[in-house]
């Protein structure tokens, strides 16, 4: 029977800098029931708080709701693993909410083959941002990403669409059935899921020709 | 620059007491976790004990247990070591170590030592 | 506790030539491992932490590797100045352990 090991923060995610959580992996075994706490401070302060809630998400994890999540302010986090051995501590972790946003897929993808008369025909694509994020504020600004691929295919054709919500591809090919996905980061932070795929039926008289 | 100078070292008989000071300089050391650890003449090292930033979580190695005391000061930038019961076994250079962090960690900087020798 | 064991005891060696020591826990300690050098007369000093990462300042000759039980400290080329004691430690448990050192000397 040993103390327990050395636990590691090893993840701090925020689907909209208005919440966020953390999740630690626990360190080895000592044989022993062991019980994990996770402490901070704000930088610029010493007083020391327990994690708001354990619960939200799900085990190793800590959850900070509204009334304990700051944009502009540096959390300072440490994980401690207590047994009837003796305990452990993580090393700290710094967090500023604003550096660890991954929002929610964007909603609503919409594919549509166009064929107008005059131009060359088209994939329109459109979608939503996420329901969690407020663009309307200013604080963020979503860069999108869009991949597809023939159903068989092994390769994804990925195209960048800055900030629009809609995109067009002229070049696909005639007869294929495509999957299309779209994925969202804000401008500091991570790249959300990819969204369901869905598929779109690209018709044989589609033509790439001008 | 990062100073770890230790002192309070010397020749004791066994059975009596010995209180070693380390004095730390060139960084903030409430950052710190902070650390005594031994050489006995021509052996390897020994962790003795360590003390978390906030004196919060303190520990001993085996040997020592019940007969050492780490404490430290934060306002005087000082850690300590206070040796009750000495033993010849004791007899060794006692070295300051800083933890590369608050709680649990490894070592980053070492002070140059000091020599206890327990002996009759 | 948690023992860790090196090994060879003692190396001897030549400049330029490829030197490994290896360090085993007792028990499962993760990545949580340190390797120092140590000069007669002079404290240590770390080399490597967190089993693989390269202290700031030194020599990229110096390389750490292994995971769980099992550590390795490699030189890729000795040098004049690397002719010293080598320990491993574990920091996975707040009670710190010492591996019992391997010196290399020279050939």
């Known amino acids: 029977q040993l103390p327990p090991g050395k636990p590691e923060i090893f993840k701090c995610r925020s689907p909209n800098k208005e919440t966020f959580t953390c999740w630690w992996r626990p360190g080895t075994d000592g044989g022993l029931p062991t019980n994990y706490s996770l402490t901070y401070h704000r930088e610029g302060e010493t007083l020391m708080h327990e994690c708001p809630d354990y619960i939200t998400g799900g085990p190793n994890s800590c959850h900070f709701g509204k009334q304990y999540t700051s944009m502009w302010r540096t959390y300072i986090m440490m994980v401690n693993a207590t047994n009837q051995m003796g305990s452990s501590f993580s090393d700290e972790l710094y967090v500023d909410v604003t550096y660890i946003v991954q929002p929610d897929p964007p909603l609503e993808l919409a594919v549509e083959v166009k064929q107008p008369e005059d131009r060359k025909p088209y994939l329109w694509i459109k979608w939503s941002p996420p329901t969690l994020i407020d663009l309307k504020t200013g604080w963020f600004t979503l860069l999108y990403e869009i991949r597809l691929k023939p159903e068989k295919a092994a390769e994804w054709e990925i195209h960048f669409a800055g900030q629009q919500t809609e995109f067009k591809i002229l070049s696909l090919h005639p007869g294929q059935k495509y999957l299309v996905q779209v994925r969202c980061k804000p401008d500091h932070g991570y790249w959300s899921a990819w969204s369901p795929a869905t598929f779109i039926q690209i018709p044989s008289d589609f033509t790439m020709n001008d | 620059e990062v100073q770890l100078v230790e002192s309070g070292g010397g020749l004791v008989q066994p059975g009596r007491s010995l209180r070693l000071s380390c004095a730390a300089s060139?960084?903030?050391?409430?950052?710190?976790?902070m650390h005594w650890v031994r050489q006995a003449p021509g052996k390897g090292l020994e962790w003795v004990s360590g003390?978390?930033?906030?004196?919060?979580?303190?520990g001993y190695g085996d040997s020592v247990k019940g007969r050492f005391t780490i404490s430290r000061d934060n306002a005087k930038k000082s850690l300590y070591l206070q040796m009750n019961s000495l033993r010849a076994e004791d007899t060794a250079l006692y070295y300051c170590?800083?933890?590369?962090?608050?709680?649990?960690?490894?070592?980053?900087?070492w002070g140059q030592g000091t020599l206890v020798t327990v002996s009759s | 506790d948690i023992q860790m064991t090196q090994s060879p005891s003692t190396l001897s060696a030549s400049v330029g030539d490829r030197v490994t020591i290896t360090c085993r826990a007792s028990?499962?300690?993760?990545?949580?491992l340190a390797w120092y050098q140590q000069k007669p007369g002079k404290a240590p000093k770390v080399l490597i932490f967190?089993?693989?990462s390269l202290e700031s300042g030194v020599p990229s000759r110096f390389s750490g590797s292994g995971s769980g039980t099992e550590f390795t400290l490699t030189i890729s080329s000795l040098q004049p100045d690397d002719f010293a004691t080598y320990y491993c430690?574990?920091?996975?448990?707040?009670?710190?352990?010492f591996g019992q050192g391997t010196k290399v000397e020279i050939k």
């Open positions: 170590a800083r933890d590369s962090g608050r709680y649990q960690s490894y070592f980053d900087y």
């Open positions: 060139g960084f903030t050391f409430d950052d710190y976790a």
């Open positions: 003390i978390i930033w906030n004196s919060g979580h303190i």
């Open positions: 028990h499962i300690i993760s990545s949580w």
């Open positions: 967190k089993a693989s």
């Open positions: 430690q574990q920091y996975n448990t707040y009670s710190r352990t």
